[in-house]
Interface confidence: medium
């Protein structure tokens, strides 16, 4: 008789989750010499230990501390790019501007990017059927707590000028409920961070509005200023051309028609 299993509102653990995490870890440590010392089996064990046999609505940051310790990584603190609701472009940018880093360019971010996972209380099984949804079920689920933990640490590490890419096509360009708005903004350290520079990415080809004047951007400016960090905002009207110019800075059209 199949055992009754809690039915959650969100999708279940990503297929072949253990194999994916292990393979990603091996690949990352091969590509990044500074992380060659990392034992990927230990990383997987620590990752698994954070959520296996635990109620998937009762996960804490403490559960992820062994994994955080193993994944400790130093990225240049003045080369950090945060993003909100525009992950693909942010990743395209750091692929071209190789000395800048998003969270997903670090080992822990790379391991978990686009994956879902959860376990079950008192069993060693991974739940491939369903996992808690942040809104409909609970916020202290394995995936949400993981991203909150790594995002907080990433923001805390930042210094000097921190850049953030924001999606100008959304109704809330800056959303207080996003990971950026709820975690990263509040964990930038004023004694280290001088300026947060927002890059607002335009979606429409003919959109010449100044989205830096958007009320949600003004709200972000207010939050940042109150934290004693300077704020600046830039429009990126044509992200395709912008990326092209970062990729090929010798292109003569790159100081006009962007």
């Amino acid at each position: 008789v199949p055992r009754w299993r809690q039915q959650w509102s969100g999708p279940g653990t990503t297929k072949r989750f253990p194999e994916t995490v292990l393979a990603r870890c091996v690949k990352y440590t091969e590509i990044h010499p500074e992380m060659r010392h990392v034992d990927c089996q230990s990383v997987w064990d620590a990752f698994k230990g954070a959520f296996i046999s635990k109620h998937p609505c009762n996960i804490t940051e403490e559960d992820y501390q062994p994994l955080m310790k193993l994944g400790t990584q130093t990225v240049p603190c003045n080369k950090i790019l945060l993003w909100s609701r525009i992950k693909d472009l942010a990743h395209q940018f750091t692929q071209v501007q190789r000395d800048m880093f998003t969270l997903e360019d670090t080992l822990l971010g790379y391991l978990a990017d686009d994956l879902t996972w959860c376990g079950e209380f008192n069993t060693s099984k991974i739940n491939y059927q369903s996992c808690p949804d942040w809104r409909k079920d609970c916020s202290n689920n394995p995936v949400s707590v993981f991203w909150k933990t790594v995002s907080r640490r990433f923001a805390e590490a930042a210094c000097d000028v921190v850049h953030v890419m924001l999606n100008g096509s959304r109704s809330k360009i800056f959303d207080k409920n996003s990971t950026f708005g709820s975690v990263e903004v509040h964990n930038l350290q004023p004694e280290k961070v001088q300026t947060l520079e927002a890059w607002v990415i335009h979606g429409g080809r003919e959109d010449s509005r100044d989205l830096c004047q958007d009320p949600t951007i003004k709200e972000l400016e207010s939050i940042i200023s109150k934290r004693n960090i300077q704020f600046s905002c830039k429009n990126i009207y044509r992200p395709d051309k912008f990326l092209q110019c970062v990729k090929n800075p010798e292109d003569s059209s790159c100081t006009s028609e962007i």
């Epitope: 003045n78 080369k79 501007q97 000395d99 000097d160 000028v161 850049h163 001088q194 300026t195 520079e197 080809r205 003919e206 959109d207 010449s208 830039k234 429009n235 990126i236 009207y237 044509r238 912008f242 110019c245 800075p249 010798e250 292109d251 003569s252 790159c254 100081t255 006009s256 028609e257 962007i258």
Partner: antibody, heavy 119, light 111 residues
Framework: QVQLLESGGGLVQPGGSLKLSCVAS????????MNWVRQAPGKGLEWIGK????????NYTPSLKDKFFISRDNAKNTLYLQMTKVRSEDTALYYC????????????WGQGTTLTVSS | EIVMTQSPASLSASLGQRATISCRAS??????????VHWYQQKSGQPPKLLIY???NLESGVPARFSGSGSGTDFTLTIHPVESEDVATYYC?????????FGSGTKLEIK
């Protein structure tokens, strides 16, 4: 905050050379196109030229193309302007300015450094 | 090269009134989406300061009494209402193609 600080100006004889520097702080210098602009006493602004982030492309206003040379050192956050064969009409206040690639506008300027060409 | 012709060369405006400065390009500085004209304010003894970019966008921190308009070859900077701290020389500048060029400047005085 963003700061650009020019230095190296002074008195030079006609035909002489001088190298100006502009030290940048408060932003990621290696991401930005940088420019030199000059202003003769009591006159308007004249764009001299610009250099892209990795120094692979440098553009000049045609009249100064073989006289002035722009370079940068991203490790030192510094922009340079090497001036050769200077004449009295090169006497001016020389500004460095940051160009924001997404608009083409000069969003930050230094305070300027003065070159005086006189015998 | 594109020549930017500014007018008038000097302008006297009363406090609280409207001041209008024009800039004409010798050929179009607009694409289908944007007009590559920028306006700067230069106060005595200071470097220029960006006021308006892409013809009509207000640079961060610039008071809303400054506005820009225009497309193609004709552009306008408007200051309304004029305040005493607006005494300065104003320049237009294009970045449509190389070389970049500036207008000759308009000096604003208060009556």
């Amino acid at each position: 905050q963003v700061q650009l600080l020019e230095s190296g100006g002074g008195l030079v004889q006609p035909g002489g050379s001088l190298k100006l520097s502009c030290v940048a702080s408060g932003f990621d210098f290696s991401l930005y196109w940088m420019n030199w602009v000059r202003q003769a006493p009591g006159k308007g602004l004249e764009w001299i030229g610009k250099i892209n982030p990795d120094s692979s492309t440098i553009n000049y206003t045609p009249s100064l193309k073989d006289k002035f040379f722009i370079s940068r050192d991203n490790a030192k956050n510094t922009l340079y302007l090497q001036m050769t064969k200077v004449r009295s009409e090169d006497t001016a206040l020389y500004y460095c300015a940051r160009l924001w690639i997404a608009t083409g506008g000069f969003d930050y300027w230094g305070q300027g450094t003065t070159l005086t060409v006189s015998s | 090269e594109i020549v930017m012709t500014q007018s008038p060369a000097s302008l006297s405006a009363s406090l609280g009134q409207r001041a209008t400065i024009s800039c004409r390009a010798s050929s179009s500085v607009s694409s289908s989406a944007f007009s590559y004209v920028h306006w700067y304010q230069q106060k005595s003894g200071q470097p220029p300061k960006l006021l308006i970019y892409l013809a009509s966008n207000l640079e961060s921190g610039v008071p809303a009494r400054f506005s820009g308009s225009g497309s193609g070859t004709d552009f306008t900077l408007t200051i309304h209402p004029v305040e005493s701290e607006d005494v300065a020389t104003y320049y237009c500048h294009h970045s449509r193609e190389l070389p970049f060029t500036f207008g000759s400047g308009t000096k604003l005085e208060i009556k």
